[in-house]
């Protein structure tokens, strides 16, 4: 779980380290804060959880690049 | 008004070593940044070196700079630069910029006017 | 790796003219993680647009910077003498990769 470390920061400090089923995603966001002590992606599934994973998988890229895809898909 | 001055620049020999200093005034490191060292050999683009979190010291470098350059905070306004192991290819003006907030994201809104080094023998 | 690239390396434009600089990411930055800025001659670069397409403060609205994914836009309209200078894109997705952050520049030269 990300930790707010004040109103407008969210640092990880651990990270998943297994796969989460890619339908489950509604939309990431990267953390690249000066108070965080890593930099991280953040996954928001659509129960509305936030996940914590690290940015240098493969697998998170991969992620990444399909969620951005849906975003640029414009649903009719 | 928030400046930034980098200093030590000077002609060095190959194999030579150099620290650089960028001086912050106008604002503090309380105030958490990401401070870079960019530089730019004559005629060429931007090249990103290294960056330091100004409130909690985490480094991140380019893997050409790794173990030739070491970034670090010397104070609540001085971030320094330093460079070992110098090859004519490291010529260059060295920048030193700071994020426009504590987000990598947001671009450098604020630079050092740069200082020359030169590496020559 | 989050390489970019800049295309054209140089262009010329006349006064009031329009010009389009092309930057490319190697992989997807998403779309809220790119930086431009403009460089003249014995000057540190200047911050023109951030997130994309958000301007810096005091930058003119003649600055449009667009994109997602992989491909990002700066247009700059109703060209001015003073934009004469060379532009780069930088990628704001990730500091864990710091090689090639920058594109290589674009030299705008204005007829």
């Known amino acids: 779980q990300p930790v707010g470390i004040n109103t407008s920061t969210t640092c990880c400090y651990r990270f998943i380290n297994k796969k989460i089923p890619k339908q489950r995603l509604e939309s990431y966001r990267r953390t690249t804060s000066s108070h965080c002590p890593r930099e991280a992606v953040i996954f928001k599934t659509k129960l509305d959880k936030e996940i914590c994973a690290d940015p240098t998988q493969k697998w998170v890229q991969d992620f990444m690049k399909h969620l951005d895809k849906k975003t640029q898909t414009p649903k009719l | 008004q928030e400046q930034l001055v980098e200093s030590g620049g000077d002609l060095v020999k190959p194999e030579g070593s150099l620290t650089l200093t960028c001086t912050a005034s106008?604002?503090?490191?309380?105030?958490?940044?990401?401070m870079c060292w960019v530089r730019q050999a004559p005629g060429k683009g931007l090249e990103l070196i290294a960056c330091?979190?100004?409130?909690?010291?985490?480094t991140y470098y380019a893997s050409w700079a790794e173990g030739r350059f070491t970034i670090s905070k010397t104070s609540s306004t001085t971030v320094t630069l330093q460079m070992t192991s110098l090859t004519v290819a490291d010529t260059a003006t060295y920048f030193c910029?700071?994020?426009?907030?504590?987000?990598?994201?947001?671009?450098?809104?604020?630079w050092g006017p740069g200082t020359l080094v030169t590496v020559s023998s | 790796a989050y390489d970019m690239t800049q295309t054209p390396a140089s262009v010329e434009v006349g006064v009031g003219g329009t010009v389009t600089i092309k930057c490319q990411a190697s992989?997807?930055?998403?779309?809220?993680?790119l930086s431009w800025y403009q460089q003249k001659p014995g000057q540190p670069p200047k911050l023109l647009i951030y997130?994309?397409?958000t301007l810096a403060s005091g930058v003119s609205s003649r600055f449009k910077g667009s994109g997602s994914g992989t491909q990002f836009t700066l247009t700059i309209s109703g060209v001015e003498s003073a934009d004469s200078a060379t532009y780069y894109c930088?990628?704001?997705?990730?500091?864990?990769?710091?090689?090639?952050?920058f594109g290589g520049g674009t030299e705008v030269v204005v007829k």
């Open positions: 910029a700071r994020t426009t907030d504590d987000n990598w994201n947001v671009g450098f809104n604020l």
């Open positions: 330091i979190s100004s409130s909690i010291g985490v």
């Open positions: 997130g994309t397409s």
């Open positions: 992989q997807s930055i998403g779309n809220r993680y």
């Open positions: 106008g604002f503090s490191f309380s105030t958490s940044y990401w």
């Open positions: 930088q990628q704001g997705a990730t500091i864990s990769y710091l090689d090639n952050a």
